[in-house]
C-alpha cells in the first residue's frame, strides 16, 4: 500500500542506504559502498539525488529508473 | 535561529480543558510538520500527533484520539494542543518539535502540565 | 504498534571512555531510526537521523549503526556535556514509537 502523509516517518529511504530530506518532499538517497548488484528495488519517487557509487552494479536495463523523475 | 517557544507550566483542574501553545519563530511555519509528544514524570516519550501547518491535516495517535485536538494558526506561526476532560494521567510535560521527512530537528522546551484540584 | 526496547536503563561511564547504547525494535524497521539526547533540564536534541546521519552541529564522536531490528548509538571520548538521558525512537510506521531512554551518568 501507498505511505501514509506524514512528516515523522522515515519513508522512501531504500534499506540500509542513508537518506536526508532536501526540502519538503524530496530526499538525498546515498546507497554508495553497500555491496549492491542491483539498483534498490523501492527507491521513492520523490529521491532527488541517488549515490550508487562503490557497488557491483555492472549493467543497468533501459529506463532502469521509471518511477523516478 | 529556529525557535518553538512553549509556556513553562499550567494548572488545571481535573474535569476541565486546556489548550497549549507553541509559537515558531526563525523558520517558514508552513514548510515544516510539528510534531506533539508527551512525557509522565521520570518517564519516556510518547508521540501524540502530528499536524501539517500548510493545510491542518493531522495524523494522531489511536491512544489520543478524543484526548487531543491539534491546530495552528498560521498567521501569528504557533501550533496549538487541546487536551480535554482532563485526569492527571495527563499530567505530564507536553512538547512541540517540527519535522521534515521525519527529521525530528528542533523540540520546545516543553510545557509542564498539572491536573490538580 | 511497535515496541522499541533499551534493555539498559542507566550505564555509568568515565570521561574518556566508549559508550554504546542500544535499541531494538519489535520488527524489522529498515533503518528508519533516530536518537536523541535529552538533558537533565528537559532540553531534547535530535543527534542522528535515518540511522546513521548525524545532525549538523553534533560533534563526530557520536555515530549510529545497526540493521533490522537491532540498533545502537556510539559516543567516542565521552564528555561532560553528553550526560543526558538517550532515547531512540522508530520513524518506520505509525505511531512512531520510542524506547525507554538510556540514562548515562558519570563513573
Known amino acids: 500500500g501507498s505511505s501514509p502523509r506524514s512528516g515523522v516517518l522515515l519513508r522512501g529511504c531504500p534499506t540500509h542506504c542513508h537518506c536526508e530530506p532536501d526540502g519538503r518532499m524530496l530526499l538525498r538517497v546515498d546507497c554508495s559502498d553497500l555491496g549492491l548488484s542491483e539498483l534498490p528495488s523501492n527507491l521513492s519517487v520523490f529521491t532527488s539525488y541517488l549515490d550508487l557509487s562503490m557497488n557491483n552494479i555492472s549493467q543497468l536495463l533501459p529506463n532502469p529508473l521509471p518511477s523516478l523523475r | 535561529q529556529v525557535q518553538l517557544q512553549q509556556p513553562g507550566a499550567e494548572l488545571v483542574k481535573p474535569g476541565a480543558s486546556v489548550k497549549l501553545s507553541c509559537k515558531a519563530s526563525g523558520y517558514t511555519f508552513t514548510d515544516y510538520w510539528m510534531q506533539w509528544v508527551k512525557q509522565r514524570p521520570g518517564q519516556g516519550l510518547e508521540w501524540i500527533g502530528e499536524?501539517?501547518?500548510?493545510?491542518?491535516?493531522?495524523n494522531y495517535n489511536q491512544k489520543f484520539q478524543g484526548k487531543a485536538t491539534l491546530t495552528v494558526d498560521t498567521s501569528s506561526s504557533t501550533a496549538y494542543i487541546q487536551l480535554s476532560s482532563l485526569t492527571s494521567d495527563d499530567s505530564a510535560v507536553y512538547y512541540c518539535?517540527?519535522?521534515?521527512?521525519?527529521?525530528?530537528?528542533?523540540w520546545g522546551q516543553g510545557t509542564t502540565l498539572t491536573v490538580s484540584s | 504498534d511497535i515496541q522499541m526496547t533499551q534493555t539498559t536503563s542507566s550505564l555509568s561511564a568515565s570521561l574518556g571512555d566508549r559508550v554504546t547504547i542500544s535499541c531494538r525494535a519489535s520488527?524489522?524497521?529498515?533503518?528508519?531510526l533516530n536518537w536523541y539526547q535529552q538533558k537533565p533540564d528537559g532540553t531534547v536534541k535530535l543527534l542522528i537521523s535515518y540511522r546513521s546521519r548525524l545532525q549538523s552541529g553534533v560533534p563526530s564522536r557520536f555515530s549510529g549503526s545497526g540493521s533490522g531490528t537491532d540498533y545502537s548509538l556510539t559516543i567516542t571520548n565521552l564528555e561532560q556535556e553528553d550526560i543526558a538521558t538517550y532515547f531512540c525512537?522508530?520513524?518506520?510506521?505509525?505511531?512512531?514509537?520510542f524506547g525507554g531512554g538510556t540514562k548515562l551518568e558519570v563513573r
Open positions: 520488527q524489522d524497521i529498515s533503518n528508519r
Open positions: 518539535a517540527r519535522s521534515l521527512s521525519g527529521s525530528v530537528d528542533y
Open positions: 525512537q522508530q520513524g518506520n510506521t505509525l505511531p512512531p514509537t
Open positions: 499536524i501539517d501547518p500548510s493545510d491542518s491535516y493531522t
